[in-house]
Structure formats: structure tokens, C-alpha cells
């Protein structure tokens, strides 16, 4: 689009005539205040479209925006529009007239607004005042638009001086309404109740002055209405609450309770639902699996955890070997049961610096007047392995034996390995594993004993070496789930008179 003259702002003389031309590759039209004033449209031989708007006998009331736009923007790539602003300084016109609705400015949030008082002359000085005040407010003024800023709920007027007379605009009224996008929250005193107990639900709306509540609930569908109570939370402004109270709940009252809230200013609405379960009687239910065999490592702390659901709140007891456990004054045992949601509980038994004596049969029992549940498991104390003895001997048979003894829980696994190159082993060369097969030059004999009192296994393994022809580094490695330990001995041939 090409506009002549291009603007974007023109100052024209009162009573004069002025011609505006707009041309484009498609039909074009001039618009003024959303209307199409009389204009001459034409199409040139080269296919260019134009429109000529002739402004005659101009007055201050011709001040304002003029737009040139495509007559039919459908099918065009861009919805192009050229804007021109014309001032016609006219001492007989003070402020340009406003429509009645422009004088009332409603706000629903803190945002910048414009008080649209405009004059015909861009040279005039315009000031903004509260209606009952003389002091000019420090708000920026745009001659084409008015005063823009963030305004309080007040009445405002604009002032200017034309010649030697002071001119006032109409009063503009700014109103801020407390309306927000509705945000509803619904909660219940309890979402699980036994029959005969009360159901009480609350629906709260924040940030609105006028709202309407509507509840839907299982009883309503069967025609049994309950009257909700609505109140304002005085200590919290713009908090409105609706309470639905159903005394002596029945099984049929189980279901979805919905609070629908509407507000008429912006026609916003929101609803939230909550499920209520009415049970015939209370319950206790275990959640998740807890293995019947649990492990703890000696001298480390261990927390044993049981998760369950219950209503009403249960009593929780822990037992070891059928004796009731309690928090110990020495801080060796700690018991806690936490309510992690309305009906979900986590009960924990913490053993601090576990001792062998704490192995045994543990039971957690959760109960109330309607139901009970119990869970039992065996606690095994894992003891890291340690090699207690590694010794070499020369029996009369001529073979050489190495004996390794160690303990641990669970049962240790024993690995024998050897290094023949003492210079490079064990720094450079990994040891060679020794087995118990027929072609080996060694034989193994391993015995395992379980010591009840210490609750651990003892492993004794004897390695028989058929013929040792040069010094040999023999290692006994014991390993179990919680550790490993190694000892090493140098075995020398019978013929050598010394041991390394």
C-alpha cells in the first residue's frame, strides 16, 4: 500500500480542503472511525487500484486516525493496513468528544490503561488531574491517544489552555473490580468415613467478590437435597467458602462431590471434584511386599519400613521374638509411625549400630477396633568376612598344605590363588586361581560350620600342594555379600632351608 502524503502525522488548517490518496495491487479503501467515508475508487491500466479521499471544509472534529486498507483482504498474503493521523487545530473545539462508554473504564487486574482525552492541536499542553485536585499528575501524554499509565479507582479530568481560556475535558471514571480467573479448591475433613460418621466438605474461592456455588453429590441425584452454608472468611479478603455437611453418612453417599463456581462479570467458571468413600467398617491393609528374610549389616544402622493403609488411625506395635519393642533409652532402637496421607501410614523400626543379638523374628502389628494386620520377617545380621588364620605346614606325606580359616555371615565363599613369579606378582601379574580338578597340582578340602551363638559361618579350607619346586605366593580370599578379606603366605620348596 502506498499513501500520499505518507504521514504518519499531518497537521492541516481549519476550513481547508485536503486530498488523501491510497494505492495498491488490490482494491483499497479509506476507513475513519470504523466507517468508510465517501471516496473515489479507480483501477489504472497497469492494474493498480487506488482510492482518493477528499476532506473538505476541515474542522477540529476531523482530527483523528485514518486507515487505508485492502477492500477485501481475503486471499491476500498480508492483512496490510496503513495508518495516518490528522490534526486540525481548531480553537472552537476543546477536547474531542468521547462516547459515553469511553468515560467509564473498568479494570479487573492491575494493568496500564489510557484515559483518551485528545485535542485538535499537537502543540497544546495537556495535563491530567484528579477530578477534585489542581495538581497535575506525572503521567505521560500522547496527543494521538491520551494519558497512559496505571491508575487508582478515582475520577480524572484533562485540562488544556487554548488561547487565554482554560478548557476541561469530561470526567473519566476508573473502576477496579475484584475479579480473577476463578480458582476453586475443594477439601474434605475426611475423604474416608465409616457409615454413621459425618461428611463435611469445603469449597473455597479466592479473589472474587461475587460468585455462585453449585454442589453436585450422590444424594442430590436421588432427590435428597442438602443445603450448603456460604460464608466469607473475614481474616482473608476475597475468600468465599461454601460448606456442604452431610450428617450420619450412608454407604450410598460414596462417590464424587463436585463444587461448581461461576462469576458473572467475566463469565468465568471453575469446578473441582473430590471422591468420598463411605465404608461399612474400618480397615487395615498392607501395601507392597516385604520379604520374609531381611538383612542388616553388623555395626551399621538399618531401617525396616512397612507401608499400610488404615481407617480409622490404628495403633502400631513392633515385636521381636514375641516381645514388645519400644524406643530404647540408649538410642539403640527407634520406632516411628508417620501418617503420609489421610489413610496411608509408614511405620519404621530403626536399629542403630546393629548387633548380632538383634537378629531374630520381627513382627509389626497395626490394629484398631474394626481390623488388624500383622507382618513378620526374619532379620539376618550380615557380618563382613575376615580371614582369621592362614598357615602353612609340611606333613610327612611330602606334600605341603596351606590352611585358611575365616568367618562371616552370610556364608563366605573361598577363593585360592597363587603367584609363581614373585618378582612380578602380585603387582604386575594377576594371581592364578587354584581349583579342585584332577589335573591340578593342588587339591582342596573345605568345611563349613554354623555357629549359632555368634550367628555366623566359619569356613576352614585346606589346600594341598603336590610338589612345590620354587617359592610360591598363595592367597586365600574370603568373600560374602558384605565384604572380602585376603591373606597371603609364601610357600617354599622342602629343599630350601629358609622361609620368606
Amino acid at each position: 500500500l502506498v499513501v500520499t502524503p505518507p504521514g504518519p502525522e499531518l497537521v492541516l488548517n481549519v476550513s481547508s480542503t485536503f486530498v488523501l490518496t491510497c494505492s495498491g495491487s488490490a482494491p483499497v479503501v479509506w476507513e475513519r472511525m470504523s466507517q468508510e467515508p465517501p471516496q473515489e475508487m479507480a483501477k489504472a491500466q497497469d492494474g493498480t487500484f487506488s482510492s482518493v479521499l477528499t476532506l473538505t471544509n476541515l474542522t477540529g472534529l476531523d482530527t483523528g486516525e485514518y486507515f487505508c486498507t485492502h477492500n477485501d483482504s481475503r486471499g491476500l498474503e498480508t492483512d496490510e493496513r496503513k495508518r495516518l493521523y490528522i490534526f486540525v487545530p481548531d480553537p472552537t473545539v476543546g477536547f474531542l468528544p468521547n462516547d459515553a462508554e469511553e468515560l467509564f473504564i473498568f479494570l479487573t487486574e492491575i494493568t496500564e490503561i489510557t484515559i483518551p482525552c485528545r485535542v485538535t492541536d499537537p502543540q497544546l499542553v495537556v495535563t491530567l488531574h484528579e477530578k477534585k485536585g489542581d495538581v497535575a499528575l506525572p503521567v505521560p501524554y500522547d496527543h494521538q491517544r491520551g494519558f497512559s499509565g496505571i491508575f487508582e479507582d478515582r475520577s480524572y479530568i484533562c485540562k488544556t489552555t487554548i488561547g487565554d481560556r482554560e478548557v476541561d475535558s469530561d470526567a473519566y471514571y476508573v473502576y477496579r473490580l475484584q475479579v480473577s480467573s476463578i480458582n476453586v479448591s475443594v477439601n474434605a475433613v475426611q475423604t474416608v468415613v465409616r457409615q454413621g460418621e459425618n461428611i463435611t466438605l469445603m469449597c473455597i474461592v479466592i479473589g472474587n467478590e461475587v460468585v455462585n456455588f453449585e454442589w453436585t453429590y450422590p444424594r442430590k441425584e436421588s432427590g435428597r437435597l442438602v443445603e450448603p452454608v456460604t460464608d466469607f472468611l473475614l481474616d482473608m479478603p476475597y475468600h468465599i467458602r461454601s460448606i456442604l455437611h452431610i450428617p450420619s453418612a450412608e454407604l450410598e453417599d460414596s462417590g464424587t462431590y463436585t463444587c461448581n463456581v461461576t462469576e458473572s462479570v467475566n463469565d468465568h467458571q471453575d469446578e473441582k471434584a473430590i471422591n468420598i468413600t463411605v465404608v461399612e467398617s474400618g480397615y487395615v491393609r498392607l501395601l507392597g511386599e516385604v520379604g520374609t528374610l531381611q538383612f542388616a549389616e553388623l555395626h551399621r544402622s538399618r531401617t525396616l519400613q512397612v507401608v499400610f493403609e488404615a481407617y480409622p488411625p490404628p495403633t502400631v506395635l513392633w515385636f521381636k521374638d514375641n516381645r514388645t519393642l519400644g524406643d530404647s533409652s540408649a538410642g539403640e532402637i527407634a520406632l516411628s509411625t508417620r501418617n503420609v496421607s489421610e489413610t496411608r501410614y509408614v511405620s519404621e523400626l530403626t536399629l542403630v549400630r546393629v548387633k548380632v543379638a538383634e537378629a531374630g523374628h520381627y513382627t509389626m502389628r497395626a490394629f484398631h477396633e474394626d481390623a488388624e494386620v500383622q507382618l513378620s520377617f526374619q532379620l539376618q545380621i550380615n557380618v563382613p568376612v575376615r580371614v582369621l588364620e592362614l598357615s602353612e605346614s609340611h606333613p610327612d606325606s611330602g606334600e605341603q598344605t596351606v590352611r585358611c580359616r575365616g568367618r562371616g555371615m552370610p556364608q563366605p565363599n573361598i577363593i585360592w590363588s597363587a603367584c609363581r613369579d614373585l618378582k612380578r606378582c602380585p603387582r604386575e601379574l594377576p594371581p592364578t586361581l587354584l581349583g579342585n580338578s584332577s589335573e591340578e597340582e593342588s587339591q582342596l578340602e573345605t568345611n563349613v560350620t554354623y555357629w549359632e551363638e555368634e550367628q555366623e559361618f566359619e569356613v576352614v579350607s585346606t589346600l594341598r600342594l603336590q610338589h612345590v619346586d620354587r617359592p610360591l605366593s598363595v592367597r586365600c580370599t574370603l568373600r560374602n555379600a558384605v565384604g572380602q578379606d585376603t591373606q597371603e603366605v609364601i610357600v617354599v620348596p622342602h629343599s630350601l632351608p629358609f622361609k620368606v
Epitope: S417, L433, E440, A481, G483, Q484
Partner: antibody
Framework: EVQLVESGGGVVQPGRSLRLSCAAS????????MHWVRQAPGKGLEWVTV????????YYADSVKGRFTISRDNSKNRLYLQMNSLRAEDTAVYYC???????????WGQGTMVTVSS | DIQMTQSPSTLSASVGDRLTITCRAS??????LAWYQQKPGKAPTLLIY???SLESGVPSRFSGSGSGTDFTLTISSLQPDDFATYYC????????FGQGTKLEIK
């Protein structure tokens, strides 16, 4: 879930260095010896290096001795392989694997590709 | 160093077949031998350790035998999921793998 996850692979020029990392979870890392095994494209498995559970012993294949260094940080459950003076023949997928003395490699990572190319 | 030699290098078979892969050590390794399965683009997984012990979670159609220098991996009834490359490994002295046996669909 017992898991090993390697990272740090990439494309590197001959003679340059690269450090691989292996994050262990789901088991007591400090209880186990750890290995690096590699596999050149279209080829078989080649054992590279091992480190004892407590870091006391480290062993290397002759092909990488003096150039590669294995290490571990038991507090972070991490295994590392520092690869220096890289050669084209080091191009491979590198796996970390769990394997104690006297045990096969029962847990493997998904592997990380190292490409040595100019 | 102990060398491990697998045979055959490639093996074609059909679902339901019984097949054997062999592995030979250059010196006695007692029963310190493991078998692994590897599928394209994946890490190896342990099938058999200590020559004949089945790793937990591995189907019972896999079995291992042998001691000293000669070892075999047997699949009693081949399943579609078994087509892969198989490696033996000794861990008596250091750690070495066989060159692999690729099992293909006939």
C-alpha cells in the same frame, strides 16, 4: 536394579586422550572388582584392564599397558578409564563389567563408543 | 598367556535343533570358564560360569560342561531368541575370550 552405565566416549585424534566413566548402581560397588572390556567394530571381545575391589591391584592387557590407567571412586560408585596416546587400533565399544576374582563378568554396561581417527 | 579357541566360527541351525559349541584352552584352566551371549548392538550377557553353573534367569536349555582344556556349550532346543554370537572366557590366569561363534538361522 543392578546397573552399569558408561559415558565419555567420542571421536578423538590419534595421540590424544579420553577419559571414560562407568556409574554403578543397585549393588555394593566397593565389594567388587571391576573390568573394562572392548570390542572393535565387527570383532570379538578383548579384556583390557581390571581393578581390585579396594583399588589395591590393577592389571592391564599388554596392548594398553603404559597408556591406559584404571581407577575407581568407591564413595561415588564410579569406575574410570584414562586413555592416553590413543591409536587407531583402540577404536572400539568399551564396556565396563563387574567381575570379582574367581567370578565371571555377571553385569555389563551398555557400552560407549570410542573412535580414534584423524 | 592362555589362548582360547572356539569352534566353529559360524554355525547355521534351525529352531528346535540341538547344538554344541566347543572351546579349547591352550593350557589347563580347571573349571574357570564362562560362556556369554551377545546380540548385535548389545552388551554380552553371562550364561554359564564355572564351566557348568547356569547363571540365574538363564533358560535351562543352555548347559555347559568340561574341565581342564576342553569345554562345550549346549543348547538343547534352539529358540528364535538364541540366534546371536557366543563367547567363551577363561578367568584362571588373567582374562581371555575366545574369538566367538556366530549362530545363524539356516
Amino acid at each position: 536394579e543392578v546397573q552399569l552405565v558408561e559415558s565419555g566416549g567420542g571421536v578423538v585424534q590419534p595421540g590424544r586422550s579420553l577419559r571414560l566413566s562407568c556409574a554403578a548402581s543397585g549393588f555394593t560397588f566397593s565389594n567388587y572388582g571391576m573390568h573394562w572390556v572392548r570390542q572393535a567394530p565387527g570383532k570379538g571381545l578383548e579384556w583390557v584392564t581390571v581393578i581390585w575391589y579396594d583399588g589395591s591391584y590393577k592389571y592391564y592387557a599388554d596392548s594398553v599397558k603404559g597408556r591406559f590407567t584404571i581407577s575407581r571412586d568407591n564413595s561415588k560408585n564410579r569406575l574410570y578409564l584414562q586413555m592416553n596416546s590413543l591409536r587407531a587400533e583402540d577404536t572400539a565399544v568399551y564396556y565396563c563389567a563387574r567381575g570379582e576374582l574367581g567370578d565371571a563378568f555377571d553385569i555389563w554396561g551398555q557400552g560407549t563408543m570410542v573412535t580414534v581417527s584423524s | 598367556d592362555i589362548q582360547m579357541t572356539q569352534s566353529p566360527s559360524t554355525l547355521s541351525a534351525s529352531v528346535g535343533d540341538r547344538l554344541t559349541i566347543t572351546c579349547r584352552a591352550s593350557q589347563s584352566i580347571s573349571t574357570w570358564l564362562a560362556w556369554y551371549q551377545q546380540k548385535p548392538g548389545k552388551a554380552p550377557t553371562l550364561l554359564i560360569y564355572k564351566a557348568s553353573s547356569l547363571e540365574s534367569g538363564v533358560p535351562s536349555r543352555f548347559s555347559g560342561s568340561g574341565s581342564g582344556t576342553d569345554f562345550t556349550l549346549t543348547i538343547s532346543s534352539l529358540q528364535p531368541d538364541d540366534f546371536a554370537t557366543y563367547y567363551c572366557q577363561q578367568y584362571k590366569t588373567s582374562w581371555t575370550f575366545g574369538q566367538g561363534t556366530k549362530l545363524e538361522i539356516k
